[in-house]
C-alpha cells in the first residue's frame, strides 16, 4: 500500500502500512516523513540515504530494537526525530551521528535506563530532549550536557528518579542554561539533598505527583533552597495517587527560592487558609491555581503583591472577594460555584478574563464593578445573564471587549458603548441581542472588528447602525435572520475589508449597498436563499473585492433570471467554491452547478 | 460489527462496538461494574494512541430508548498543566491509566442507553477513536 501524499513532494504519511523497510519510492525532496507503527525493527547505517532534505522524521512504535552507527547519517537538515515507543535494546555510540541540525529529540518509552550512555553529546543544536516514560534512576546530568548549550526543554517525567544529589547538577554550574525548562513530574522522589539546586537558574521547573506524603513533599521542597526559577509548577494529577494530607507546612520551603511565577495544578484537597499556605509566595509576579477547591474566598483580599492572578477550573463556595492593589491581569475562567459576580477592587487592573464561568451580572459595566479605570481588555464571554445598566463609565480605556455566548439584557435601551472611543475589538455574537435602536454602536469611533453573529434585528431589517464606525475593517452579521437591509447601511464603512452576511434569509442580491465599501476584499453571502437579483441591472461590486461567496443559495435557473445568471458568470474570478453553487429550481435542473449552465433563452422553451 | 463486552452489574450490562474505520485496539475495564442507581469505582484504560493526546476532548451523542439527546462536548485536556497525566501522552506511547469515578442519586428508567464517544485530539484536530457504548438497564426497583 502506498504512502499518503499530504503535501506533494514534501510530506508523506506512511503510518501503519506494515512496512518492514524504509520505502524507496518517495521523492528525494521529501521533508516530512511519518513511518510510525511499521515493523522496521532495525535501522542500519545510512538508513535514510534517499532522504537528503528530511526535516521531520516520525518513527513512533516501529518495533525498533537496534540502531546502528550512522543510521541517520546524511540527514543534515533533520530538525525533529521522534522515536516514541520503540523497545530499543542496542543503541550504537554513533547512532545519532550526522544530525547536525537536530533541535528536537523524542525518545519517550524507549527502555532508556540512563542519560550517561545516551549518545547525544555532539548534538549541539538540540533545543528539546524528551526522555519521559523511561527507566532512568539517576538525575545526574552527564558532562556532555555542557555541549548542549541550546537546550531549552528537558522532560524527565515518569522515570524512576528517587533522589537528587548536589553532584547531579554540577554541569549546570559550569554552563548555566538560563532558559532550561525541566519537567520531573511523576518520579517517585523522596530526597533532594539541600544545596543541590543552590545557585541554579531554571526557566521552568515542574514537579507534579512526585511525593507520596506531606513530609516527603516538605523536605524535598526544602531541598530546592537556593534555586532561582522563573516559573514553578507544583501539584498532582487526578488519575494518579494523591496526597492524604496537605497543609501550610508543605510549602514553607518555598521561602528559600527565588520565584517569578507560581502555579499549583490540581490538588485533591480543600484549600482553606490560603494566606498561611502561600505565605512564601506573596511577592511572586504571577500566581496561578488550576483545578483546586477553595473554601475561604475572602483570603484574596490579603495584601498579596501579585501582578497576574489566574484561577482556572477551580471550585469556589461563592465568587471570591478580590482586593489586590498591584494586580494588572486577572484570569478567572471555567470555574464552578459562586454564580453571581460581585464587585472587585483592583485599582491597577488592565486585563480581565472572566469567561466560561456561568456568571450572572446584575449590572454591567462601570468602574465600580472592577474597581479600576485602567482596564483595556475585558472578556465576559460564555457566561449567564448580563444586564447592561451602565455605559462603561470610568472604563474608557477599553480596547477589547468580548461578550459572545452570554445573554445580554437591555442592549437596545440606550447607547451602551457611548464612552468606548478607544475600543478596537467588540464581540457580541450569540448574545440574544435584538437590535431595535439605531444608536446601539454610537461612540465606537475606533472600532476595527465587530462580531455580532447569531443575533436578531427588529423586522429582520438591518438599519443604519454603523454610521460612526469609520475605522471598521471586519464585520460579521451571519446568522442574524436578516431579510432586508437599508441601502445606506454600510455607507460610512470605507475601511471595511471583510463582511460576513452568511446564514441569513436574503432572497435576492443587490450590489447597491456596497458601493461605498472601497476597501472590501471578502464578501460572504453563503447559506442564504438568494434566487435572483433585486434589480434587473446589477452594478459591479467594489474593485477591491477579491472573494465573493455565494455558495449554498437557492438559485433559480430559469429564463427570467438569465441576466442575473450571466452576471454571476461574469464574476467567476471572484467566486469561491463554485462547485457548491447549484440550481435549486426548476426541479429538472436541481443540483446542477450554476456556472456550468448554458444560459440561452431556450432554457425553458 | 464485533461487540466487546465490558461488564455486568446488578442493574446494567455494558458493551461497546467501534464506530470508526481504524478500530485501533483499546482495553476498557470497570471495577466494580457500574450500577446506574449509584456507583463508585475505577475505570482502567490501556491504549496506544495514534496521535498525541494534547487537547483531547470527547463528543458524546447519547440516545435514550431511541430519543437523541443534544450533542455534548467534554474537554478532557486543555493543553497545558492538565488534570490528567495521560494528557501528555504522545502518539505511540502506552497509556495505562486508572480513573476513579462516582455518581449517586440519578434515577434512570428501564431501557437501552446508547452513547457514541468520539475522541478528538491534536492540532490539527483529528479523530482518535470512536466507540459506541450500549448500556442495557434492568432496574430492580424503578
Amino acid at each position: 500500500e502506498p504512502c499518503v501524499e499530504v503535501v506533494p513532494n514534501i510530506t508523506y504519511q506512511c503510518m501503519e502500512l506494515n512496512f518492514y523497510k524504509i520505502p524507496d519510492n518517495l521523492p528525494f525532496s521529501t521533508k516530512n516523513l511519518d513511518l510510525s507503527f511499521n515493523p522496521l525493527r532495525h535501522l542500519g547505517s545510512y538508513s535514510f540515504f534517499s532522504f537528503p532534505e528530511l526535516q521531520v522524521l516520525d518513527l513512533s512504535r516501529c518495533e525498533i530494537q537496534t540502531i546502528e552507527d550512522g543510521a541517520y547519517q546524511s540527514l543534515s537538515h533533520l530538525s525533529t526525530l521522534i522515536l516514541t515507543g520503540n523497545p530499543i535494546q542496542s543503541l550504537a555510540l554513533g547512532a545519532f551521528s550526522g544530525l547536525s541540525s537536530l533541535q528536537k529529540l523524542v525518545a519517550v518509552e524507549t527502555n532508556l535506563a540512563s542519560l550517561e550512555n545516551f549518545p547525544i553529546g555532539h548534538l549541539k543544536t538540540l533545543k528539546e530532549l524528551n526522555v519521559a516514560h523511561n527507566l532512568i534512576q539517576s538525575f545526574k546530568l552527564p558532562e556532555y550536557f555542557s555541549n548542549l548549550t541550546n537546550l531549552e526543554h528537558l522532560d524527565l517525567s515518569s522515570n524512576k528518579i528517587q533522589s537528587i544529589y548536589c553532584t547531579d547538577l554540577r554541569v549546570l554550574h559550569q554552563m548555566p542554561l538560563l532558559n532550561l525548562s525541566l519537567d520531573l513530574s511523576l518520579n517517585p522522589m523522596n530526597f533532594i539533598q539541600p544545596g543541590a539546586f543552590k545557585e541554579i537558574r531554571l526557566h521552568k521547573l515542574t514537579l507534579r505527583n512526585n511525593f507520596d506524603s506531606l513530609n516527603v513533599m516538605k523536605t524535598c521542597i526544602q531541598g530546592l533552597a537556593g534555586l532561582e526559577v522563573h516559573r514553578l509548577v507544583l501539584g498532582e494529577f487526578r488519575n494518579e495517587g494523591n496526597l492524604e494530607k496537605f497543609d501550610k507546612s508543605a510549602l514553607e520551603g518555598l521561602c528559600n527560592l527565588t520565584i517569578e511565577e507560581f502555579r499549583l495544578a490540581y490538588l485533591d484537597y480543600y484549600l482553606d487558609d490560603i494566606i498561611d499556605l502561600f505565605n512564601c509566595l506573596t511577592n511572586v509576579s504571577s500566581f496561578s491555581l488550576v483545578s483546586v477547591t477553595i473554601e475561604r474566598v475572602k483570603d484574596f483580599s490579603y495584601n498579596f503583591g501579585w501582578q497576574h492572578l489566574e484561577l482556572v477550573n477551580c471550585k469556589f463556595g461563592q465568587f471570591p472577594t478580590l482586593k489586590l492593589k498591584s494586580l494588572k491581569r486577572l484570569t478567572f475562567t471555567s470555574n464552578k460555584g459562586g454564580n453571581a459576580f460581585s464587585e472587585v477592587d483592583l485599582p491597577s487592573l488592565e486585563f480581565l478574563d472572566l469567561s466560561r464561568n456561568g456568571l450572572s451580572f446584575k449590572g454591567c459595566c462601570s468602574q465600580s464593578d472592577f474597581g479600576t479605570t485602567s482596564l483595556k481588555y475585558l472578556d465576559l464571554s460564555f457566561n449567564g445573564v448580563i444586564t447592561m445598566s451602565s455605559n462603561f463609565l470610568g472604563l474608557e480605556q477599553l480596547e477589547h471587549l468580548d461578550f459572545q455566548h452570554s445573554n445580554l439584557k437591555q442592549m437596545s435601551e440606550f447607547s451602551v458603548f457611548l464612552s468606548l472611543r478607544n475600543l478596537i475589538y467588540l464581540d457580541i455574537s450569540h448574545t440574544h441581542t435584538r437590535v431595535a435602536f439605531n444608536g446601539i454602536f454610537n461612540g465606537l469611533s475606533s472600532l476595527e472588528v465587530l462580531k455580532m453573529a447569531g443575533n436578531s434585528f427588529q423586522e429582520n431589517f438591518l438599519p443604519d447602525i454603523f454610521t460612526e464606525l469609520r475605522n471598521l475593517t471586519f464585520l460579521d452579521l451571519s446568522q442574524c435572520q436578516l431579510e432586508q437591509l437599508s441601502p445606506t447601511a454600510f455607507n460610512s464603512l470605507s475601511s471595511l475589508q471583510v463582511l460576513n452576511m452568511s446564514h441569513n434569509n436574503f432572497f435576492s442580491l443587490d450590489t447597491f449597498p456596497y458601493k461605498c465599501l472601497n476597501s472590501l476584499q471578502v464578501l460572504d453571502y453563503s447559506l442564504n436563499h438568494i434566487m435572483t437579483s433585486k434589480k434587473q441591472e446589477l452594478q459591479h461590486f467594489p474593485s477591491s473585492l477579491a472573494f465573493l461567496n455565494l455558495t449554498q443559495n437557492d438559485f433559480a435557473c430559469t429564463c427570467e433570471h438569465q441576466s442575473f445568471l450571466q452576471w454571476i458568470k461574469d464574476q467567476r474570478q471572484l467566486l469561491v467554491e463554485v462547485e457548491r453553487m447549484e440550481c435549486a429550481t426548476p426541479s429538472d435542473k436541481q443540483g446542477m452547478p450554476v456556472l456550468s449552465l448554458n444560459i440561452t433563452c431556450q432554457m425553458n422553451k | 460489527q464485533k461487540q466487546y463486552w465490558v461488564c455486568n452489574s446488578s442493574d446494567a450490562s455494558i458493551s461497546y462496538t467501534y464506530c470508526d474505520k481504524m478500530q485501533y485496539p483499546i482495553s476498557i475495564n470497570v471495577n466494580p461494574c457500574i450500577e446506574l442507581k449509584r456507583s463508585k469505582g475505577l475505570l482502567h484504560i490501556f491504549y496506544i494512541p495514534r496521535r498525541d493526546l494534547k487537547q483531547l476532548y470527547f463528543n458524546l451523542y447519547i440516545t435514550v430508548n431511541t430519543m437523541n439527546l443534544p450533542k455534548r462536548k467534554e474537554v478532557i485536556c486543555r493543553g497545558s498543566d492538565d488534570d490528567y497525566s495521560f494528557c501528555r501522552a504522545l502518539k505511540g506511547e502506552t497509556v495505562n491509566t486508572t480513573i476513579s469515578f462516582s455518581f449517586k442519586g440519578i434515577k434512570f428508567s428501564k431501557g437501552k442507553y446508547k452513547c457514541v464517544v468520539e475522541a478528538i485530539s491534536g492540532s490539527p484536530e483529528e479523530m482518535l477513536f470512536c466507540l459506541e457504548f450500549v448500556i442495557l438497564h434492568q432496574p430492580n426497583s424503578n
Epitope: K21, I22, D24, P27, F28, G44, S45, Y46, S47, F49, S50 | -
Partner: nanobody, 117 residues
C-alpha cells in the same frame, strides 16, 4: 553484493572542471538509488547528488546546484558526476554509493578531488 569503483578525481584549479565516474558490478539489479557523497577533512560525510535508477529523478545539494550534474549510463552500469566551476571548498574525498532494495548501502573506496591554485 555490489562493487563500486570510482575514478576521475585529481587536482584542478578554481573554476575548472572534472568528471567522476562510478562503475557498478555484482548484484546491480537490486540497486534503487545511486549517488555521490563527499567528506572534507574533519567534517561529516555529506550528500552531493543522487539519482534514482528506475525513473532518473535527481537531487542536488544546495552547495553544488547549477555547477554539478549527475547522470547515468544504464548500458555501462555507470554513474557520472560532471563538476564545473569548481571552488576550493569542493576539496574532499568523493564517494560513490548505491542503495539496494533491502535498504543496504554500498560504498566505493573514494577518489580525492583537490581544488587549488
Amino acid at each position: 553484493e555490489v562493487q563500486l569503483v570510482e575514478s576521475g578525481g585529481g587536482l584542478v584549479q578554481p573554476g575548472g572542471s572534472l568528471r567522476l565516474s562510478c562503475a557498478a558490478s555484482g548484484s546491480i539489479f537490486s540497486i534503487n538509488d545511486m549517488g555521490w557523497f563527499r567528506q572534507a577533512p574533519g567534517k561529516e560525510r555529506e550528500h552531493v547528488a543522487l539519482i534514482r535508477i528506475k525513473d532518473g529523478s535527481i537531487y542536488y545539494a544546495d552547495s553544488v546546484k547549477g555547477r554539478f550534474t549527475i547522470s547515468r549510463d544504464n548500458a555501462k552500469n555507470t554513474v557520472y558526476l560532471q563538476m564545473n566551476s569548481l571552488k576550493p571548498e569542493d576539496t574532499a574525498v568523493y564517494y560513490c554509493a548505491a542503495k539496494t532494495g533491502t535498504s543496504f548501502v554500498y560504498w566505493g573506496q573514494g577518489t580525492q578531488v583537490t581544488v587549488s591554485s
